[in-house]
């Protein structure tokens, strides 16, 4: 069941030291391996990422039309796919947290949904028949995220906004803002 | 050009010591972390030692820890490896490498220096 | 023992893809980025691939890297005779003291 969008425009999450998650603690001694900690590099620093957009996670609004079968919504829905990549070395030298930026590998963070927003839509259906009404769950915000074992590796693929879309039937993850944590997904909808 | 140097590797006795060096040249070289990586006969690569830009960001492998130390100097461009109570299984081709972004992978390399560890 | 997983050998004629797999674990791979490196026949490693799937400039976009779950992998596309190497992912491992881990290596030939 295709699906028809077109890219309206895209925001970039420019991430600041308090949007990343404290690493999990590290067990590998007690030393202060962070300069961020003493006061900061001095200006001149290496880890500033001379290509600003080498690493960038980015909100790209999609506008479409939820289909079921062949069923369509009335309107167009607008929603947000996560793309673009995240990294540390993205990040000014106050702002690695205690991450041990100077390491050749470290925590990996990736660009992935956020919040979410649950929308009533009305599906007009072919042959007169009634119009059916239908909750869907939409992204509403993406950021910079460490990877752990518990994000669902659906929303973690690499390359480009294919990955951040939700896949049919898989279990929505319970969320601590309130919202339902069986709310539905976007069933059908692709 | 981006070079590093190595230089101290030789034929030592098993439990003696022995003092490696990498000299760099052809960047701003406190703007590098720079590691050890080694590479036994006819292996692969081990990760041994790596130091930010001062004495405070050190690291090592299990496998060198108590007995090797790491540590550099900025005002020479100079990386070392102090090597004590060296054993037969420290017998490889020692690399000096650099990364100058963060969490970037080691992305300059020198050619190596052989240690061999013998009686 | 290496505590990320190579095969040990790859091969494929020129014009093939090829695709080298990396296997580790949540205190790897799993929750840290990923690099690879291309070793020359007796020369010093190169830097390949870095935070899962970037290139440094001067590598050609023939080769690539992703990233799923406590696996990475390279691929290689449009092999070329001088792709013959040894080649090598590392991550950060996060367990007892921290160390950065290399795999053991896939030697890879152009047949």
């Known amino acids: 069941q295709g699906w028809q969008a077109f890219k309206n425009d895209a925001t970039e999450i420019i991430p600041e030291l308090g949007e990343y998650p404290e690493p999990p603690p590290e067990l590998e001694n007690n030393k202060t391996m962070n300069r961020a900690e003493n006061g900061g590099r001095p200006p001149h620093h290496p880890f500033e990422t001379k290509d600003v957009s080498e690493y960038s996670c980015r909100e790209l609004h999609f506008t479409r039309y939820v289909t079921d079968g062949q069923c369509r919504s009335a309107k167009p829905v607008t929603e947000l796919v996560c793309s673009g990549q995240c990294g540390p070395a993205r990040l000014l030298p106050n702002a690695i947290g205690r991450g041990k930026w100077w390491r050749p590998s470290g925590p990996d963070f990736r660009c992935i949904p956020d919040r979410y927003r649950a929308q009533r839509v009305q599906l007009l259906c072919p042959g007169g028949a009634a119009p059916r009404a239908r909750k869907v769950r939409l992204v509403a915000s993406c950021k910079c995220k460490r990877l752990t074992r518990f994000h669902n590796q659906s929303e973690l693929k690499d390359f480009g906004p294919e990955a951040a879309r939700p896949q049919k039937g898989r279990k929505p993850r319970p969320r601590a803002r309130g919202a339902k944590a069986n709310q539905a997904e976007l069933e059908n909808a692709y | 050009e981006v070079q590093l140097v190595e230089s101290g590797g030789g034929l030592v006795q098993p439990g003696r010591s022995l003092r490696l060096s990498c000299a760099a040249s052809g960047f701003t070289f406190d703007d590098y972390a720079l590691h050890w990586v080694r590479q036994a006969p006819g292996k692969g690569l081990e990760w041994v030692s790596g130091?930010?830009?001062?004495?405070?960001?050190?690291d090592y492998a299990d496998s060198v820890k108590g007995r090797f130390t790491i540590s550099r100097d900025n005002a020479k461009n100079s990386l070392y490896l102090q090597m004590n109570s060296l054993r037969v299984e420290d017998t490889a081709l020692y690399y000096c490498?650099?990364?100058?972004?963060?969490?970037?992978?080691?992305?300059?390399w020198g050619q190596g220096t052989t240690v061999t560890v013998s009686s | 023992q290496s505590v990320l997983t190579q095969p040990p050998s790859a091969s494929g004629t020129p014009g093939q893809r090829v695709t080298i797999s990396c296997s580790g674990s949540w205190s790897n791979i799993g929750s840290n980025t990923v690099n690879w490196y291309q070793q020359l026949p007796g020369t010093a490693p190169k830097l390949l691939i870095y935070?899962?799937?970037q290139r440094p400039s001067g590598v050609p976009d023939r080769f690539s890297g992703s990233k799923s779950g406590t696996s990475a992998s390279l691929a290689i596309s449009g092999l070329q005779s001088e792709d013959e190497a040894d080649y090598y992912c590392?991550?950060?491992?996060?367990?007892?003291?921290?160390?950065?881990?290399f795999g053991g290596g896939t030697k890879l030939t152009v047949l």
């Open positions: 590392a991550a950060w491992d996060d367990s007892l003291s921290g160390e950065y881990v």
């Open positions: 935070n899962n799937n």
């Open positions: 490498a650099g990364n100058n972004r963060g969490y970037g992978g080691l992305d300059v």
């Open positions: 130091i930010g830009w001062d004495e405070d960001m050190i």
